[in-house]
Interface confidence: low
Amino acid sequence: KKVVLGKKGDTVELTCTASQKKSIQFHWKNSNQIKILGNQGSFLTKGPSKLNDRADSRRSLWDQGNFPLIIKNLKIEDSDTYICEVEDQKEEVQLLVFGLTANSDTHLLQGQSLTLTLESPPGSSPSVQCRSPRGKNIQGGKTLSVSQLELQDSGTWTCTVLQNQKKVEFKIDIVVLAFQKASSIVYKKEGEQVEFSFPLAFTVEKLTGSGELWWQAERASSSKSWITFDLKNKEVSVKRVTQDPKLQMGKKLPLHLTLPQALPQYAGSGNLTLALEAKTGKLHQEVNLVVMRATQLQKNLTCEVWGPTSPKLMLSLKLENKEAKVSKREKAVWVLNPEAGMWQCLLSDSGQVLLESNIKVLPTWSTPVQP
C-alpha cells in the first residue's frame, strides 16, 4: 500500500493509473466503501462522502489513463485509506494528514517559550525535528518546546515530520518581540545634549502599548520614573514627564528620548519597559549614561566621570601632543600646578577611547592673584 503524507490546509493529489491510455470508468472510495468521486463518460460524478465539496480530479489527464483524486484544504480527519477502482483493479493509497501549530501567537516576547504542537491521525507515530533560523535543532514527538526565546530565533522555523520513511515539511514564521539591543551606554561631556534611542528588532503593521523609563541616578538613593508614554499605531504620546530632567520624546518610532544636557546628577542607569497590547510580559532595554567633567580650580586640574563604568576603565589627563601625565583606574584624576596649554581628559575602557574633554590652562601670570 502506497503511503502519502499531507499537510493540514494544503492540497494533495493521489494518483491512479490505468494500463490503457484512454478515458475509462474509475471510482475513488474511502475505507468505508463510500464513493468519493468517479466519472460517467466525460462527466465528473461525486458520491455522498464528507469530502464532497473539497474533492476533485483532473479531467485533462483522463485521456492519458490518469485518474487522480485531488483533496483541497486537508483536514486531519481526511487521513484514511483511499481506493481507486479502475479496469477491475483496486489501487490503495494511505493518506496521513499532519498539522503543526504554534502554541499561541507566533509573535512572542524575548524570553518567552515557544511550543509547537503536532496534530496527527490516530495510530500514527511520527517523529518531528525542527530547525531554528540560527541552525539550532530540536526533536520531539507530539510537542516541542523552546524556552527563553532569543532575538536570533526570529524568522522561519523549518520542521520535518517523519512517518513510514516519508517526510513532510512545515515552515512556521516566528517573530520575537524585542529591542535591537538589550543594553546601551551613552558617553557625554557635561552640558552636552543626550540622545537615547530604543530601536525595535521587529516590524508589525500596528503597534499599540504603553511604556515607562525608570532611572537610577548614581548619586540618588532610589530610582524614579522619568517619563511614561503611550503608543498607538506607531504614534508616541507622552503621558507624564518629570520636571527634572525635562525629557523630550519623539512622536514616531523608533522610540527616541532627548535629555537637554548631561549633568553629573543624571549619570546612572535606566530601564525602559514597553508593554504591548494583547501580550503578557514586557520588553526591556537598559540604558546607561556616563558624564565627564574637566575643571580647573586654582592650582588643581581635575577630570571626573560619573555613571556605570566597567572594570577596565582608565581615566587619563594629558597635555596636547604629550604623553599622559596621569592615568588611573579611578573615576577622578588630577594634576597639581598644570603647565599652560590645552589639556585632554580621556576615558578609555578596555583600551577603547570612549570620551574626551579638552580644557585650556592659562599661564599662571594671566590668572588673578588670590587675596
Epitope: P311, K318, E323, A324, S348, G351, Q352, V353
Partner: antibody, heavy 113, light 112 residues
C-alpha cells in the same frame, strides 16, 4: 580573526634608532589600545608603553621615557614603535599587543657594532 | 612600580598531574570596584605569549577549562588540573592596575 603583523628583523648600530611597525586587521583599529612589550634573549617580558589610536593618547614606562615614541596611523591601521639611542642591551624581540590579549609575532632587533 | 614575584621558577610535572604557580605583588591589585587587575600569560617555545586568565580568575576565550586562576589582593595562583604535553612553556603573571604594567619573572613548566 584578529591579526597583528609586525615588520621584519632589524640589525642596528649602537646610538641609532629603530622603527617597528605593527599592522592590525580583523577588528576596529581605533577601538583598542596597542601596547608594546619587549623580551631580551632568554629573559622575561618588559612593558614599554601604550597608545590609544583613537585619541592618540600615549603612556610610556619611566625606564624608556625620552627614548621611545609610539604612534598610530588610523588610515592604514598600523601602529609604530620607535626606539632611539640604541644600546646593546636593547637587543630583544619587540611585540605589539592589542589590548592585552592578541600578540603580534614579534620583531627581533639586534644592536651590535 | 609594582613588583611581581613568581614561584617556583621551574616546575617539572608528570602529564595528568596537577600543577600550581604562585604570583605575589608588592601592593594590592584589588581595585575598589572589586576586581583584581592580574592577568596570566603562557609563552610556548618559539611562540608569542597568549592570554590565559584576565582580572584574576576569568578564562580568556578558547582557553581549556583545566586552567583556573584564583586569589585576591597580593596573592594569586594559577592552577592546571591535569597537565598535558601541550602546556609546556613559560607562564607569566602581569599586573594591569597601575602603569607601568609589570610582569613576574616567569615560571618554566616542563614535562618530567
Amino acid at each position: 580573526q584578529v591579526q597583528l603583523v609586525q615588520s621584519g628583523a632589524e640589525v642596528k648600530k649602537p646610538g641609532s634608532s629603530v622603527k617597528v611597525s605593527c599592522k592590525a586587521s580583523g577588528y576596529t583599529f581605533t577601538s583598542y589600545d596597542i601596547n608594546w612589550v619587549r623580551q631580551a634573549p632568554g629573559q622575561g617580558l618588559e612593558w614599554m608603553g601604550v597608545i590609544s589610536p583613537s585619541g592618540d593618547a600615549t603612556l610610556y614606562a619611566q625606564s624608556f621615557q625620552g627614548r621611545v615614541t609610539i604612534t598610530a596611523d588610523e588610515s592604514t591601521s598600523t601602529a609604530y614603535m620607535e626606539l632611539s639611542s640604541l644600546r646593546s642591551e636593547d637587543t630583544a624581540v619587540y611585540y605589539c599587543v592589542k589590548g592585552l590579549d592578541h600578540w603580534g609575532q614579534g620583531t627581533l632587533v639586534t644592536v651590535s657594532s | 612600580d609594582i613588583v611581581m614575584t613568581q614561584s617556583p621558577l621551574s616546575l617539572p610535572v608528570t602529564p595528568g598531574e596537577p600543577a600550581s604557580i604562585s604570583c605575589r605583588s608588592s601592593q594590592s591589585l584589588l581595585h575598589s570596584n572589586g576586581y583584581n587587575y592580574l592577568d596570566w600569560y603562557l609563552q610556548k617555545p618559539g611562540q608569542s605569549p597568549q592570554l590565559l586568565i584576565y582580572l584574576g580568575s576569568n578564562r580568556a576565550s578558547g582557553v581549556p577549562d583545566r586552567f583556573s586562576g584564583s586569589g585576591s589582593g597580593t596573592d594569586f595562583t594559577l592552577k592546571i588540573s591535569r597537565v598535558e604535553a601541550e602546556d609546556v612553556g613559560v607562564y607569566y603573571c602581569m599586573q594591569a592596575l597601575q602603569s607601568p604594567w609589570t610582569f613576574g619573572q616567569g615560571t618554566k613548566l616542563e614535562i618530567k
